[in-house]
């Protein structure tokens, strides 16, 4: 287990528990109860009240992390008296030896690396191991493959994403035969993660008046349509002057991509690259590679 | 451009089955997902289901569990949806629309519609 | 009954503004889920105005904008045009029905 936990209780104890692994909270049930009620306090005073599961006896946190410290609290009205009971659920463990500087990005569609830093003030045989869970909580992946400096774990690529829903728990625990090593939590959303691949397929067709240029949407891990893409172009004369302003053009993204723009010949020699965003986050991708049109001699 | 032809309308008896086509021209079927509302005067637009690219299958309003089917043949880029059991409450005309965007699915384009009857 | 519900009918003269309100409960845009507009006019299929809550499709006008704030949404049209004249529905998506929900529809009347 990850951390010690400590129990403030009155005399007649519901002997509440939390599980990490579920993060469900319990507590031995009572009779005639009349009203349960959990709840947990974070190091910011934020108050977290989710709710009760059918039995009444324990409740299920959802979107939560830990690492900072967290305060269960429960309290249960029987038809003859009230019971309160406090959970501490502290991050054991020497302050400064957990994981930081945590981030996780997934590219190529169905890729993804997550690295982190050993802490200050961790001991040199420290290591550090990654778990993550969806959020079904049905599914706990252990890190496939680790990234090391020194010996140490400081990453970890995963080449199958099978198991990830729209938003994951990232467990970073570490062990020491010197000292105990705090635990690293995160909550990430896959869709602010991935780092889309550019468009492919992009081509460029002229007529003496106009030229049309056409696009794929990237290949994403996340189900996105059409709509939920914005391209930007960069159409790019060739040979211009340093410092010559380039023509960007933002598009929404649509069933057959393309954009159409007026040209006549005889054209000089341009350019042009394509990026994608996700029209919610516009978290950019890299450009598309250049594809030129026009003549040297337009 | 992408366009969706349904099938003609439909007079049916009360207890029959109906089964409307949506044809994609312009697009392929298997890169796309295909949804079903209908419209009624009294109810106005009800979701009857659809593609969910997250489940990987096609998924169900609660309320038609049971009574709707719908199938896809990609080959002809040509979905179906048939609704069994029908009650006079289900005349409306039926739409499919792909959707255009996730969560939630945004609908467009719509196919025109076909208006299903029942009436005994 | 409409999940979403908005009013049955607003009015304005050409070039004015007109808003149309679309309310809802934590289950759907308070959840919060995204909105979705539609404008569809006599005898003919929906067409998507607004997606993402306040997004526009290409070839939708700007005079078209939306915004959400809580368990609500709005549909605002500037410079109201003679075309315009149409019913207007919200959608959005609803976790205890696990399914899109429509508003029961706006018409819009151009005086």
């Known amino acids: 287990e990850k951390s010690d936990l400590r129990t403030v209780a009155p005399a007649s104890s519901l002997n509440v528990r939390f599980d990490s692994r579920t993060m469900n909270l319990s507590w031995d049930c009572q009779e005639n109860t009349t009203f349960s009620k959990c709840f947990l306090t974070d190091k910011k005073n934020r108050v977290v009240e989710p709710r009760l599961s059918n039995n009444e006896c324990s409740c299920t946190f959802r979107e939560i992390c830990l690492h900072e410290g967290v305060t269960f609290e429960v309290h249960v009205n029987t038809s003859q008296r009230g019971f309160q009971q406090k959970l501490l659920y502290p991050n054991s463990g020497r302050e400064g030896t957990a994981a930081q500087n945590f981030s996780c990005f997934i590219y190529n569609a169905d890729l993804m690396n997550c690295t982190w830093a050993r802490g200050p003030t961790a001991p040199r045989d420290v290591q550090y191991f990654l778990y993550i869970r969806n959020s079904k909580r049905r599914r706990e992946i252990r890190c496939p493959y680790y990234i090391q400096d020194s010996g140490t774990h400081v990453g970890c690529h995963l080449d199958n994403l099978s198991g990830l829903t729209s938003r994951n728990y990232f467990l970073v625990n570490g062990t020491s035969r010197e000292i105990g090593i705090q635990f690293f939590d995160s909550l990430l959303d896959t869709k602010k993660i991935e780092r889309f691949n550019p468009p492919s397929n992009v081509t460029v067709r002229c007529n003496t008046t106009h030229c049309l240029v056409r696009w794929k949407q990237p290949r994403t891990y996340q189900k996105l349509s059409y709509l939920d893409f914005q391209y930007q172009l960069d159409v790019h004369r060739k040979n211009t002057q340093p410092g010559t302003e380039n023509l960007l053009i933002n598009v929404s993204g649509d069933l057959e991509n393309r954009y159409n723009f007026p040209s006549s010949e005889p054209r000089a020699k341009h350019s042009v690259k394509i990026r994608a965003a996700d029209v919610r986050i516009l978290n950019w991708s890299s450009w598309s590679e250049a594809i030129e049109f026009g003549s040297d001699d337009g | 451009q992408v366009q969706l032809v349904q099938s003609g309308a439909e007079v049916k008896k009360p207890g029959a089955s109906v089964k409307v086509s949506c044809k994609i021209s312009?697009?392929?079927?298997?890169?796309?997902?295909i949804h079903w509302v209908r419209q009624t005067p009294t109810k106005g637009f009800e979701w009857m289901g659809g593609f969910d690219p997250e489940e990987n299958e096609i998924v169900y309003a609660q309320r038609f569990q049971g009574r709707v089917t719908m199938t896809e043949d990609t080959s002809i880029d040509t979905a179906y949806l048939t609704l069994s059991s029908l009650r006079s409450d289900d005349t409306a005309v039926y739409y499919c629309a792909i959707v255009g965007s996730f969560s939630p699915p945004a609908y467009r384009p719509w196919g025109k519609g076909t208006m299903v009857t029942v009436s005994s | 009954q409409a999940v979403l519900t908005q009013p049955s009918s607003v009015s304005g003269a050409p070039g004015q503004r007109v808003t149309i309100s679309c309310t809802g409960s934590?289950?759907?845009?308070?959840?919060?889920?995204?909105v979705s507009w539609y404008q569809q006019l006599p005898g003919t299929a929906p067409k998507l105005l607004i997606y993402?809550?306040?997004k526009r499709p290409s070839g939708v006008p700007d005079r078209f904008s939306a915004s959400k704030s809580g368990t609500s949404a709005s549909l605002a049209i500037t410079g109201l045009q003679a075309d315009d004249e149409a019913d207007y529905y919200c959608q959005s998506y609803d976790s205890s029905l696990s399914g899109s929900v429509f508003g029961g529809g706006t018409k819009v009347t151009v005086l």
């Open positions: 993402h809550n306040n």
């Open positions: 934590g289950s759907n845009i308070g959840a919060p889920y995204d």
């Open positions: 312009g697009h392929s079927l298997s890169e796309l997902s």
